[in-house]
């Protein structure tokens, strides 16, 4: 018998290796796993990061490294321990033969091993013609606070610290971890070596062309004169920052990573640890005209990942490539022909393009926001960056069709005032990775640790899905979407909000199996409905029109198909009030939307009824979008009728608190 799924098999393997950078990996934590870069030319075999289990002490790391050396020597292999990690991740960097991997994976405390790989500066081209320094009129860009309370760390090339733009603003640390330049005929030329870092330092905090003119910077050299570095060098740089932070705690820290390599589990893990230590990390999405989730650190959820747009709000094209896109991008920022300090001379300027420049803009904006509100958490900062962005200005036609819905249509902007945003209920939409096409495949979307999951929806391009539900995982609610048999896979879409002192729970009603449909409401006193989800065990959900969508006087109620279980997200928070807003269209239509009014924030987005011709629902900024199958493929008019259901909330408590501050 032929294997009917042969093509699918190849596709899954290709996607897996790119998404996870994964070699063979047992799943239940019994054995350590080995990972390597999915981009072959970027691999650096012979150097490996051995990551140890979370609670491993430095002495155990050193002992494990020595044990590896001893066991390798007994087999006739030479090894060299290049670095022992501690402070961020426990582990060590070792130079050894790949033959020893099997042995190394069996060592005590080993969590996983990753082969080292290259990372690259994300700017193109490096030197265009020089331009004279632009003169600013007094009424031009003069921000109220230049980020003076914030320190920005730049992990990049060496820099020309005596450039007039950045002189006295950038402290060059003694940190350097770079690979040898390629090619025997390479001549180091200071101006070339300093080009990328100098330009970015200028974009962040330059006197004339900088975003946060008051921010002080520290530079670490992790990229060589060709703009190339390694994952291991970047890791050691991040560890250096963490140790500096512990030795001498200062105000808010922003770390700018204007570089990208292939997906790296270890680099993402290090970024996560640093972010959880209170550091804001900003990175380039990458210049590969590709899904940013396939690159690191762009794919790390804790990092603010920035794509590049031009003056016309078009995604930036860079030669045959261009800005990365997709669900791992948080927002876009200017990244084409950006004028900044040139390392050719101390008063020279140059224009450079790329997601590095875009990330530098966001690092500057972040520095200013943090200077105005030093207590902002990473989650609060990210939500503010999204909230103050210009919405729906990017021409999405540039992105591949399947990525358009996943890519945020947001261009970073400075807040109109650095104070006074505290009253707002901030929410953002988080898309999961694609589930894959098997019947039992699920996709999970998660909010950041200090965000609340207020609603959960799902989306499938084929329309074959079994809905979604909110469930507890590790003490936190997550959004899980379910694929259906013969489907192409699903996405889970979480609505993640900042809601201080919130107490949220999920109330579920099993399938009603009656013609009335399934209903569930928030019955606890003081709890309001923030989102509705529905999930069904049947593969084909028959058509069903609830006779009444929502009885009057029952705003706190979710309704759905009689064969589905319905889940209501019910929250109690000081001053929280919510209302349900519906927009129904009697005739078939591919897209139905409903938006929340000014002053209200969209927390929930769902579709009625949940029948199989509905592809799903998702929030775009403050609008709930319900997508249905192509009108021509939909059956009767009655089956095509769809209602978009938005739940709009606001917090009177936040508003009052903000007024009291003023």
């Amino acid at each position: 018998q032929e294997d009917e799924d042969g093509d699918y098999e190849e596709l899954v393997l290709a996607l897996r290796s790119e998404e996870d950078g994964l070699a063979e990996a047992p799943e239940h934590g019994t054995t350590a796993t080995f990972h390597r870069c999915a981009k072959d030319p970027w691999r650096l075999p012979g150097t490996y990061v051995v990551v140890l289990k979370e609670e491993t002490h430095l002495s155990q790391s050193e002992r494990t490294a020595r044990r590896l050396q001893a066991q390798a020597a007994r087999r006739g292999y030479l090894t060299k321990i290049l670095h022992v990690f501690h402070g961020l991740l426990p582990g060590f960097l070792v130079k050894m033969s790949g033959d020893l991997l099997e042995l190394a994976l069996k060592l005590p405390h080993v969590d996983y091993i990753e082969e080292d790989s290259s990372v690259f500066a994300q700017s193109i081209p490096w030197n265009l013609e020089r331009i004279t320094p632009p003169r600013y009129r007094a009424d031009e860009y003069q921000p109220p606070d230049g980020g003076s309370l914030v320190e920005v760390y730049l992990l990049d090339t060496s820099i020309q610290s005596d450039h007039r733009e950045i002189e006295g603003r950038v402290m060059v640390t003694d940190f350097e971890n770079v690979p040898e330049e390629d090619g025997t005929r390479f001549h180091r030329q200071a101006s070339k070596c300093d080009s990328h870092g100098t330009h970015l330092a200028g974009v962040v905090s330059g006197r004339d062309a900088g975003v946060a003119k008051g921010a002080s910077m520290r530079s670490l050299r992790v990229l060589n004169c060709q703009g190339k570095g390694t994952v291991s060098g970047t890791l050691i740089g991040l560890e250096f920052i963490r140790k500096s932070q512990l030795v001498q705690p200062v105000g808010p820290l922003v770390v700018l990573l204007p570089l990208a390599g292939g997906y790296s589990r270890v680099l993402n893990a290090a970024c996560q640890r640093l972010a959880r230590a209170g550091v804001v990390l900003v990175t380039a999405a990458g210049n590969f005209r590709d899904d940013a989730c396939l690159y690191s650190p762009a794919s790390a959820p804790e990092v603010i990942t920035v794509g590049a747009t031009n003056a016309q709000d078009q995604p930036v094209t860079l030669g045959t490539l261009g800005t990365n896109f997709g669900r791992c991008v948080d927002l876009f920022a200017p990244g084409e022909d950006i004028i900044g300090a040139s390392s050719d001379c101390s008063t020279c300027f140059v224009s450079q393009s790329g997601t590095s420049q875009a990330a530098a803009h966001v690092a500057g904006i972040a520095a200013m926001m943090l200077s105005a509100e030093p207590e902002l958490t990473l989650a609060e900062l990210r939500q503010r960056l999204i909230h103050f962005s210009a919405k729906d200005v990017i021409n999405e036609a540039w992105f591949p069709e399947d990525q358009r819905v996943l890519t945020p249509n947001l261009v970073a902007a400075l807040p109109p005032s650095t104070h006074g945003a505290g009253w707002q209920l901030f929410c953002r939409t988080v898309w999961s990775a694609h589930s894959g096409p098997t019947r039992m495949a699920t996709a999970v979307a998660r909010c950041a640790p200090d965000e609340e999951l207020l609603s959960c929806s799902s989306f499938s391009r084929s329309g074959k899905r079994r809905g979604e539900r909110m469930e507890a995982q590790g003490g936190k609610l997550v959004c899980r979407a379910h694929n259906a048999f013969g489907g192409e896979g699903v996405y889970a879409i979480a609505r993640c909000c900042l809601l201080p002192q919130a107490n949220c729970s999920v109330h579920t009603a099993p399938p009603a199996e009656a013609s009335m449909g399934t209903r569930v409401h928030c019955h606890q006193q003081g709890h309001v409905l923030t989102g509705c989800s529905s999930h069904w065990e049947v593969e084909d959900l028959g058509t069903h029109k609830p006779p009444v969508l929502r009885p009057r006087g029952q705003p706190n109620q979710c309704v759905g198909h009689r064969e589905a279980s319905i889940h209501a997200s019910c929250c109690h928070a000081p001053g929280l009030e919510c209302k349900v807003k519906e927009h129904g269209i009697p005739a078939p239509q591919e897209q139905v939307t409903v938006a929340c009014e000014e002053g209200w924030t969209l927390t929930g987005c769902s579709a009625l009824p949940g029948t199989s011709h509905v592809l799903g629902a998702y929030a775009v900024d403050n609008t709930c979008v319900v997508r249905s199958r192509d009108v021509s493929t939909t059956g009767s008019t009655s089956e095509g009728a769809v209602t978009a259901v938005a739940i709009c909330c606001r917090s009177r408590h936040l508003a009052q608190a903000s007024q009291e501050l003023q």
Epitope: Q1, D3, E4, D5, Y8, E9, V12, L13, R16, E27, S435, G436, P437, T438, R439, M440, A441, T442, A443, F485, G486, E537, V538, E539, D540, G542
Partner: antibody, heavy 117, light 108 residues
């Protein structure tokens, strides 16, 4: 060529334990939903358990809490850990692969589990 | 749980004749029904899925029809290798995935 090979069956006393293995070749097991189906002598087929490509697990009511399904991607194998075995669990146990657009497209040859005192 | 019933329990047919096997679901399962053939000492073999689609390598004499709750497997002209037990299975509502009790097709 796609192949599934079960092992681990045998004779066990009531209350005892067994671990069935299903080794896959010709495809990557963790890319598919994999199932265990059993058949008592002279009887029909009964679905027992499944593990999804994303790791979710499912069981029939009569084995819930007694049987555990798992997989090892490195070995391209999946398992059925059977505890507190009962006489009624006596059957030939088959592992089967569920296709993307087809139900059970490949089956193993089966392994006999006998629970008897 | 959806209960699948098959009729008849045994069907005696002469080679070359037509065989019609029935399967009924206790509630609608759309078109998510499969048919399997099992010979003594062997594992089942997928014949039909989606109620009417033949699996790879299955001869054209096997055909399936039906949707909702009533399904039929037809073998247009029985060959000697077709004498076996045939099971229907629903995979619309799960877990569990449920099979019918089987129909034994033997030589008349």
């Amino acid at each position: 060529e796609v192949q599934l090979v079960e092992s681990g069956g045998g004779l066990v006393q009531p209350g005892g334990s067994l671990r069935l293995s299903c080794a896959a070749s010709g495809f990557t097991l963790s890319s598919y939903d994999m199932h265990w189906v059993r058949q008592a002598t002279g009887k029909g087929l009964e679905w027992v358990s499944a593990i999804g490509s994303t790791g979710d697990t499912y069981y029939t009511g009569s084995v819930m809490g007694r049987f555990t399904i798992s997989r090892d991607a490195a070995k391209n194998s999946f398992y059925l850990e059977m505890n507190s075995l009962r006489v009624g669990d006596t059957a030939v146990y088959y592992c089967a692969r569920e296709g993307i657009r087809t139900p059970y497209d490949y089956w193993g040859q089966g392994t006999l589990v006998t629970v008897s005192s | 749980e959806i209960v699948m019933t098959q009729s008849p329990a045994t069907l005696s047919v002469s080679p070359g004749e037509r065989a019609t096997l029935s399967c009924r679901a206790s509630q609608s399962v759309s078109s998510n029904v499969a048919w399997y053939q099992q010979k003594p000492g062997q594992a089942p073999r997928l014949l039909i899925y989606g109620a009417s689609t033949r699996a790879t390598g299955i001869p054209a004499r096997f055909s399936g029809s039906g949707s909702g709750t009533e399904f039929t497997l037809t073998i247009s002209s029985l060959q000697s290798e077709d004498f076996a037990v045939y099971y229907c299975q629903q995979y619309n509502n799960w877990p569990p995935f449920t099979f019918g009790p089987g129909t034994k097709v033997d030589i008349k």
